[in-house]
């Protein structure tokens, strides 16, 4: 099909960065300023993306490729090609409709984006909590109590807890 198309379509060989100009008997013309064509054989050039407001330019538009945006400091990209910018939060927080909120007890977030996740429940793997979890960090699980020889560790095996992965204080 592609070969048939190229034999029939007088525009198929106009290179990237140009368009097949119907107003000029289908000769190839360069893309006008602030537009691009990333493939050959195009009948129009696409308007360049403009990185405005919370977006900033990561890569300038050229005649053959669109501009690429990222987000200004304090924001991060979401969606394909950074279609949206979302506010950063601190580690130990998550973004809600009302803004950045601290992670609830028993959850953590070690990034500036995303949601708070539950601490690992060490007891599900038959292990003990070696380091307690915080809002910013997951718990660290240690060896299972059975693996410890007497006096080898002062870690107290967790009692059945209502909060997953939290060892009694």
């Amino acid at each position: 099909f592609e070969r048939t198309r190229s034999l029939q379509d007088p525009c198929s060989n106009c290179p990237a960065g140009t368009f097949c100009d119907n107003n000029r008997n289908q000769i190839c013309s360069p893309c006008p300023p602030n537009s691009f064509s990333s493939a050959g054989g195009q009948r129009t050039c696409d308007i360049c993306r403009q990185c405005k407001g919370v977006f900033r330019t990561r890569k300038e538009c050229s005649s053959t490729s669109n501009a690429e945006c990222d987000c200004t400091p304090g924001f991060h990209c979401l969606g394909a090609g950074c279609s949206m910018c979302e506010q950063d939060c601190k580690q130990g927080q998550e973004l809600t409709k009302k803004g950045c909120k601290d992670c609830c007890f028993g959850t953590f977030n070690d990034q500036k984006r995303g949601i708070c996740r539950p601490w690992t429940n060490c007891s599900l793997d038959g292990k003990s909590v070696l380091v307690n979890g915080t809002k910013e960090r997951d718990v660290v699980c240690g060896p299972s109590p059975a693996d410890l020889s007497p006096g080898a560790s002062s870690v107290t095996p967790p009692a059945p807890a209502r909060e997953p992965g939290h060892s009694p204080q």
Epitope: S12, C14, R24, N25, I27, C28, S29
Partner: nanobody, 121 residues
């Protein structure tokens, strides 16, 4: 406005050489294919040679090995170097701006006014 201006035609003996030029203006020369065509007295216009922006070339069987098409993008000019000329090469030679940068099954968007080449003893 697209303009194509041929030059270099004239009278030459069989076996001789000529170089035709076509000066182009009014469009982006470097991204478009150019071609040479000819029309002998009492006959239709026929394809001779073409060159695309990437310098790929195509020739009519009747001129292969004798004619060479080339281009100078800095000068917006396409050339046809003709050697081992024969009486049957006598014709008006036309420069053509080809649609869509195509040299395969080319079609002409704009024509020059032509230059006469006469091959006779």
């Amino acid at each position: 406005e697209v303009q194509l201006l041929e030059s270099g035609g004239g009278e030459v003996q069989p076996g001789g050489s000529l170089r035709l030029s076509c000066a182009a203006s009014g469009f982006s020369f470097s991204i478009n294919a150019m071609g040479w065509y000819r029309q002998a007295p009492g006959k239709g216009r026929e394809f001779v040679a073409a060159i695309e922006s990437g310098r790929n070339t195509v020739y009519a069987e009747s001129v292969k090995g004798r004619f060479t098409i080339s281009r100078d993008n800095a000068k917006n000019t396409v050339y046809l170097q003709m050697s081992s000329l024969r009486a049957e090469d006598t014709a008006v030679y036309y420069c053509g701006l080809l649609k869509g940068n195509r040299v395969v099954s080319p079609s002409v968007a704009y024509w020059g006014q032509g230059t006469l080449v006469t091959v006779k003893p």
